[in-house]
């Protein structure tokens, strides 16, 4: 197993409808044509697995039906989109990735984005 | 270094606006937040809201909502802070500061706003 | 919304005295979004501790965070002439995000 750098940016304010999107950049020393991605969140000292696909290089990401998560891939980036967020699901949202094939197998953690989710102010009462 | 610097000080009158603005070097500003805090004259400090340079959204304190407005030009690395309708309870020093995973810092040097008729 | 109270409002005491600042949340507050603030007469605010409990970089280890759900303090080992100042709390775990009142730690 060898290392490999990937950045990610450190802090993102989830939209008011609790999407999330942020790039996963990956440093690959080959040329990989298949690669794993999976979002790992951080809180409270716990880590839980949020979604992962694997991918050929030059396709989309394909994660599970039910997944939370879309993505697409560009060369060694990867835009991350995480929807259905809740201010409860406000923490350290980690990327890791593997590069699988050829050998040798590469894997790389980025630091973490922190993900701030607010959910909307409910509208008030109104008469009609 | 990790540096906020910010715009000096502004006298404005009632009614009127100011854009107060935070310039940031040492690191790389679309991958951080922008807070503003600010601090009337002995008193304590207020949580304005805070903008994720990343992608622009904004998240604002209940009670200024509609007043204010936060916004960042990343060709410059410099978030700004526009507060209207100012009432004399507006007079203070506005601060902005880095916002990380889990912290404000640095902190920019502050700017005084000071509403006088 | 989550309110901070700190006490006490101010302490008085004498260089190379321990400090216990206090910081009661209204509601639980998860411990990776208390943070700790320092400021002096005429300065910006500067970070000591974050996550309850983990010093900022440069910040000497006479300075250390505690605490979980409601309840945090700020410890101050042996008072410094430099450590007289206003401190405050800050969570940021949930919106709106809020400040103490702060506490004032002035020389007795």
């Known amino acids: 197993c060898k290392a490999m750098h990937v950045a990610q940016p450190a802090v993102v304010l989830a939209s008011s409808r609790g999407i999330a999107s942020f790039v996963c950049e990956y440093a690959s020393p080959g040329k990989a044509t298949e690669v794993r991605v999976t979002v790992l969140r951080q809180a409270d000292s716990q880590v839980t697995e949020v979604c992962a696909a694997t991918y050929m290089m030059g396709n989309e990401l394909t994660f599970l039906d039910d997944s939370i998560c879309t993505g697409t891939s560009s060369g060694n980036q990867v835009n991350l989109t995480i929807q259905g967020l809740r201010a409860m699901d406000t923490g350290l949202y980690i990327c890791k990735v593997e590069l699988m094939y050829p050998p040798p197998y590469y894997l790389g953690i980025g630091n973490g984005t922190q993900i701030y989710v607010i959910d909307p102010e409910p509208c008030p009462d109104s008469d009609f | 270094q990790v540096q906020l610097v910010q715009s000096g000080a502004e006298v404005k009158k009632p009614g009127a606006s100011v854009k107060v603005s935070c310039k940031a070097s040492?690191?790389?500003?679309?991958?951080?937040?922008i807070s503003w805090v600010r601090q009337a004259p002995g008193q304590g400090l207020e949580w304005m809201g805070w903008?994720?340079?990343?992608?622009?959204?904004?998240n604002y304190a209940q009670k200024l909502q509609g007043r204010v407005t936060m916004t960042t030009d990343t060709s410059t690395n410099t978030a700004y802070m526009e507060l209207r309708s100012l009432r004399s309870d507006d007079t203070a020093v506005y601060y902005c500061?880095?916002?990380?995973?889990?912290?404000?810092?640095?902190w920019g040097q502050g700017t005084l706003v000071t509403v006088s008729s | 919304e989550i309110v901070l109270t700190q006490s006490p409002g101010t302490l008085s005491l004498s260089p190379g005295e321990r400090a216990t600042l206090s910081c009661r949340a209204s509601?639980?507050?998860?411990?990776?979004?208390l943070a700790w603030y320092q400021q002096k007469p005429g300065q910006a605010p500067r970070l000591l501790i974050y996550?309850?409990?983990s010093r900022a970089t440069g910040i000497p280890d006479r300075f250390s965070g505690s605490g979980s759900g409601t309840d945090f303090t700020l410890t101050i080992s042996r008072l410094e002439p430099e450590d007289f100042a206003v401190y405050y709390c800050?969570?940021?775990?949930?919106?709106?995000?809020?400040f103490g009142q702060g506490t004032k730690v002035e020389i007795k």
């Open positions: 500061a880095r916002v990380g995973a889990n912290w404000f810092d640095p």
């Open positions: 040492g690191y790389t500003f679309t991958s951080y937040g």
């Open positions: 903008i994720s340079a990343y992608n622009g959204n904004t």
């Open positions: 509601q639980s507050v998860s411990s990776s979004y």
């Open positions: 996550g309850a409990s």
């Open positions: 800050q969570q940021y775990g949930s919106s709106p995000w809020a």
